[in-house]
């Protein structure tokens, strides 16, 4: 049972990319607000965005804590204008949300080319290490910093005159491929999991190419 | 259980087409590469090509270039390998394979293959 | 494309031998190296992968070394479920070779 006029949240859902996790619910309130708890398997429960008319909540700074855990939350739901209003088992009606674990499931964020560099027949592509709101020592960690060997690039490139994408990967951030001599590159990367069996793959980062300004061609 | 199964073998005369599948299922095609690899009567195992089904990229061995093209469908789960201009050269049991993308892009799962004749 | 020269390709073996199969690639190929064990009329199946790590599933009689480019697989006491053809191949690059096989047949 719950209180009076008021609906359970329903369709839980966790949006999460790059540890940045939002908590999404429905319905829109009508004469209703929403308290959001988080906690762990083994933790006490944390209230968030207090009576609030929004139907999502920003958790990015709990699950931050340890992104290695395993999180739940829940939506209650109140009467507007009489949140200490309860039903008759004393409690508000509230939803709870799946189980879920940032590092298992958050959403790999679309890469970027920082730069890439040629030098003779060997061209050096190198992966911006995006920051997260991961913070150790009160520094933001970045992706591989989190992940480490456990996050690996696959690089696409091909000859602007071809289509047929060559593949390399790394599981740094830096990619030595050969190329020939003359021929103008394009470049695409992807982040990847291979551990993973969901989320295993960002989109693909925006492609760059050989004769643009990120690059710098070396003759040797 | 994670299965590959390739289907549409058979045989073709010099010139002619066929389309092989790749039926996956226990993991989402899109979240991996997948190759097809075919080996000839008696002979070792010669890579062909792969797709990425979240972005439709293709790479082709120079032996097939032109002639074949693989593509995904990946509301079917499924690859194919459309084969054209088929020479006696490209006889052979025909496998698609799973890329977990990992640094060493081994193959983990393999279809059970099936058998296409070029013969007049 | 990046050679993959796999020796002997034959060999002949009694159960419980040692059994040492090599593969050299023509250029650096870093540890991006796997085995494969085929038998007749079946798919290849994954041993090892990234030179010398076991794949699930596989027995620990089966071992993969690196040595630069050369890449050794090695059976330390064959069993009768182990006479099949074995092969390497790089995916340093694209596209990724194949070893032309070796053939474990019983002495």
């Known amino acids: 049972s719950g209180t009076t006029n008021t609906v359970a949240a329903y369709n839980l859902t966790w949006k999460s990319t790059n540890f940045k996790t939002i908590l999404e619910w429905e319905p829109k309130p009508v004469n209703q607000v929403y308290t959001v708890q988080i906690s762990t398997k083994s933790g006490d429960w944390k209230s968030k965005c207090f009576y609030t008319t929004d139907t999502e909540c920003d958790l990015t700074d709990e699950i931050v804590k340890d992104v290695k855990q395993t999180y739940l939350a829940r939506v209650f739901s109140y009467p507007a204008g009489n949140v200490e209003s309860t039903g008759s088992a004393g409690e508000p009606l509230y939803e709870n949300s799946p189980e879920f674990t940032p590092y298992l499931e958050t959403n790999l964020g679309q890469p970027t080319i920082q730069s890439f560099e040629q030098v003779g027949t060997k061209v050096n592509v190198t992966v911006e290490d995006e920051r997260t709101l991961v913070r150790r020592n009160n520094t933001f960690l970045s992706l591989r910093d989190v992940f480490g060997k456990d996050l690996i690039y696959t690089l696409y490139y091909w000859k602007s005159s071809s289509s047929g994408k060559k593949t390399a990967k790394t599981n740094t951030n830096e990619f030595l491929i050969d190329v020939d001599k003359g021929e103008n590159y394009c470049f695409s990367v992807q982040a990847v999991i291979p551990s993973r069996t969901v989320n295993r793959k960002s989109t693909d980062s925006p492609v760059e190419c050989m004769g643009q300004e990120k690059g710098e061609f070396r003759e040797i | 259980e994670v299965q590959l199964v390739e289907s549409g073998g058979g045989l073709v005369q010099p010139g002619g087409s066929l389309r092989l599948s790749c039926a996956a299922s226990?993991?989402?095609?899109?979240?991996?590469?997948i190759h097809w690899v075919r080996q000839a009567p008696g002979k070792g195992l010669e890579w062909v090509g792969y797709?990425?089904?979240?972005?439709?990229?293709?790479y082709y061995a120079d032996s097939v270039k032109g002639r074949f093209t693989i593509s995904a469908d990946t509301s079917k789960n499924t690859a194919y390998l459309q084969m054209n201009s088929l020479r006696a050269e490209d006889t052979a049991v025909y496998y698609c394979?799973?890329?977990?993308?990992?640094?060493?892009?081994?193959?983990?799962?393999w279809g059970q293959g099936t058998l296409v004749t070029v013969s007049s | 494309d990046i050679q993959m020269t796999q020796s002997p390709s034959s060999l002949s073996a009694s159960v419980g031998d040692r059994v040492t199969i090599t593969c050299r690639a023509s250029?650096?190929?870093?540890?991006?190296v796997a085995w494969y064990q085929q038998k007749p009329g079946k798919a290849p199946k994954l041993l090892i992968y990234?030179?010398?790590f076991l794949y699930s599933g596989v027995p620990s009689r089966f071992s993969g070394s690196r040595s630069g480019t050369d890449f050794t697989l090695t059976i330390s006491s064959l069993q009768p479920e182990d006479f099949a053809t074995y092969y390497c191949?790089?995916?340093?690059?694209?596209?990724?070779?194949f070893g032309q096989g070796t053939k474990v047949e019983i002495k």
């Open positions: 394979a799973r890329d977990i993308q990992s640094v060493s892009g081994e193959f983990d799962y």
């Open positions: 226990g993991f989402t095609i899109s979240h991996y590469i």
């Open positions: 797709i990425d089904p979240s972005n439709g990229y293709t």
């Open positions: 250029q650096d190929v870093n540890t991006a």
């Open positions: 990234s030179a010398s």
């Open positions: 191949q790089q995916h340093y690059t694209t596209p990724p070779t």
